[in-house]
């Protein structure tokens, strides 16, 4: 099943201590999906969309950008035939970068 769309939600982090907000959205015919956020291949957070919605926002507390490294991806799962869970392809990556300190 098709990959979700992913984006950073403002306010964007300006340091590693700032929280990170990431939205993931499934295609229109997959409301109420279960979403998983990954960073560097490891699960960071799981959220379920409301039954009438096709997306979620992951709110990661400050400091969560330190480890593991690498870009964020998200994926969603839906119940298919015979109540078996089907997983989507992974989203495109989203990289979180911080402004270079000027001191």
């Amino acid at each position: 099943i098709p990959a979700p769309s992913i984006r950073l939600v403002p306010p964007y982090p300006s340091s590693q201590e700032d929280p990170i907000h990431i939205a993931c959205m499934a295609p229109g015919n997959f409301p109420g999906a279960n979403f998983t956020l990954y960073r560097g291949g490891q699960v960071v957070q799981l959220l379920q969309a409301p039954t009438d919605q096709r997306g979620v926002t992951f709110n990661l507390s400050g400091g969560s950008s330190k480890a593991p490294g690498g870009p964020f991806h998200c994926q969603y799962g839906v119940l298919g035939e015979l109540n078996q869970s089907q997983l989507s392809d992974l989203s495109e990556p989203v990289n979180v970068s911080f402004p270079v300190p000027t001191w």
Partner: antibody, heavy 119, light 107 residues
């Protein structure tokens, strides 16, 4: 039913500042973004910036950086937009609006505040 | 900044016509696109979010499609109350830029 009620029309001199308020009533304030969009007479829509009251950090379009300040007071469910160093090109209707955090889609708009900059 | 270009800038149509408005982004915005309708002297109204989801309370004659850089808003059968200006908006990254608008007028 959530409503956003904005302060009244303003007439300002070039070089001065204006502060527009936006009070939310009848619904949740803090778990959405409040954005500000302006529309000059006969022109299109221009996004200025926004704030998520729950997070407290404002963000701005580069065009307005340094000239606009967006704040929010969760205790009164009120957001504010202050624009300084006004010029005639800032004459516009200023809208506050409530954005869904997933889609950044604006489902609820204030009634608009006309700011006229004239000497 | 991501530029959004709508076409046409204006069109004339009759009640019952099928109307299509296109919006092109200067770079890939995936499905992060919203459509609004605005009538003179009024605040805009959300029609479509996430490129294709119909906002609650919006008539089903409105539909949105597209992904990447090219998007379409379709009104399947134009009604008298649909004569207005329509805007697309990208929300992939700030600033959340709008298209210049498409004015739908009565033929």
């Amino acid at each position: 039913q959530v409503q956003l009620v904005q302060s009244g029309a303003e007439v300002k001199k070039p070089g001065s500042s204006v502060k527009v308020s936006c009070k939310a009533s009848g619904g949740t304030f803090s778990s959405y973004a409040i954005s500000w969009v302006r529309q000059a007479p006969g022109q299109g829509l221009e996004w200025m910036g926004g704030i998520v009251p729950k997070f407290g950090t404002a963000y701005y379009a580069q065009k307005f950086q340094g000239r606009v300040t967006i704040t929010a007071d969760e205790s009164t469910s009120t957001a504010y937009m202050e624009l300084s160093s006004l010029r005639s090109e800032d004459t516009a209707v200023y809208y506050c609006a409530r954005e869904n955090l997933v889609y950044s889609a604006i489902a609820i708009w204030g009634q608009g505040t006309l700011v006229t900059v004239s000497s | 900044d991501i530029q959004m270009t709508q076409s046409p800038s204006s069109l004339s149509a009759s009640v019952g016509d099928r109307v299509t408005i296109t919006c092109r982004a200067s770079q890939d915005i995936s499905n992060w696109l919203n459509w609004y309708q605005q009538k003179p002297g009024k605040a805009p109204k959300l029609l479509i979010y996430g490129a294709s989801s119909l906002q609650s309370g919006v008539p089903s004659r409105f539909s949105g499609s597209g992904s990447g850089t090219d998007f379409t808003l379709t009104i399947s059968s134009l009604q008298p109350e649909d004569f207005a200006t329509y805007y697309c908006q990208q929300v992939t990254s700030t600033p959340f830029t709008f298209g210049q608008g498409t004015k739908v007028e009565i033929k």
